[in-house]
């Protein structure tokens, strides 16, 4: 027995039924992507990172989900201390607030 057609990657098993006239076939099939690949064509890649290149996990669709304290398309921008002046403060680590020269205070304001 052979089956021809598109089967999208899924964790669920699909039941296929086939009647050849001589015999009746019923079988279960599933297609899964390789580790860290996602999407209908398994053509999206996401592997969790926590380094210079980004700080993220991956959701069930292969989208990057930033770790707490990080943001941006690659989750490599730190979220500064709440209230940190966007004009006179900045940070490279989450929750930090580093002041520009000439500015001071908890929020560099």
């Amino acid at each position: 027995a052979s089956h021809s057609g598109m089967i999208n990657p899924s964790r669920q098993w699909q039941t296929l039924k086939q009647n050849t006239g001589v015999a009746h076939f019923e079988y279960q099939i599933r297609v899964t992507c390789d580790d860290y690949y996602y999407g209908f064509g398994c053509n999206k890649f996401c592997r969790p990172r926590d380094d210079f290149f980004g700080h993220y996990a991956c959701d069930q669709n292969g989208n990057k989900t930033c770790m707490e304290g990080w943001m941006g398309p690659e989750c490599n921008r730190a979220i500064c201390r709440q209230g940190c002046s966007p004009k006179h403060g900045s940070c490279k680590l989450p929750g930090d607030c580093r002041c520009q020269y000439g500015w001071q205070g908890l929020y560099c304001d």
């Epitope: 390789d34 890649f45 210079f52």
Partner: antibody, heavy 116, light 107 residues
């Protein structure tokens, strides 16, 4: 569309420094890191380093440590690569490239010739 | 640093041939591998990223496979425009080293 446009060819003497620029357009400059890659005549590709355009942090290949400086000017969406103490072996085409999962976009290349 | 061993360094083939280029890494890089094509006087062109994902606009005769330390670039049926030099590169950790290249020539 995304473009990376590099500065023109340079002829330098041994011991001098060279600064190559890479002006980008077509996307938010600080969203993507910029890498620098070089290729000596008839040779393969050599990765030199990466700069995080948002923070200005850079990481260099060991071979270039102490001789290379990568910087950015976010106001003009331009990345720079400066190589000092030039020697004849530094004669190469220098490329800037954008990306995280490989380099989909490259500059046109800048030929740097080091000769006395 | 992660070492990249690309083979063969040169290869002669004919239009219509199936060609395979391999890249081996000195340590596990998962699927952080990219393949490029370069023609003389031009910047490299991205073909495949994350070991097996075809970049947009790249013909389907190109395919990539492998993970861990062993990777393959396959061209199923060579076309005249495919004669060029091919490079692999890892993007797992710094430095992002390249393989030595494979020059694909017309037989």
């Amino acid at each position: 569309q995304v473009q990376l446009v590099q500065s023109g060819a340079e002829l330098k003497k041994p011991g001098a420094s060279v600064k190559v620029s890479c002006k980008v357009s077509g996307y938010a400059f600080t969203d993507y890191a910029i890498h620098w890659v070089r290729q000596a005549p008839g040779q393969g590709l050599e990765w030199m380093g990466i700069i995080n355009t948002y923070y200005g942090d850079s990481k260099y290949a060991q071979k270039f440590q102490g001789r290379v400086t990568m910087t950015v000017d976010t106001s003009t969406s331009t990345a720079y690569m400066e190589l000092s103490s030039l020697r004849s072996e530094d004669t190469a085409v220098y490329y800037c490239a954008r990306g995280y999962d490989g380099f989909a976009y490259w500059g046109q290349g800048t030929l740097v010739t080091v000769s006395s | 640093d992660i070492q990249m061993t690309q083979s063969p360094s040169s290869l002669s083939a004919s239009v219509g041939d199936r060609v395979t280029i391999t890249c081996r890494t000195s340590e596990n890089i998962y699927s952080y591998l990219t393949w490029y094509q370069q023609k003389p006087g031009k910047a490299p062109k991205l073909l495949i990223y994350n070991a097996k994902i075809l970049d947009s606009g790249v013909p389907s005769r190109f395919s990539g496979s492998g993970s861990g330390t062993d990777f393959t670039l396959t061209i199923s049926s060579l076309q005249p425009e495919d004669f060029a030099t091919y490079y692999c590169q890892h993007h797992y950790d710094i430095p992002w080293t390249f393989g030595g290249g494979t020059k694909l020539e017309i037989k």
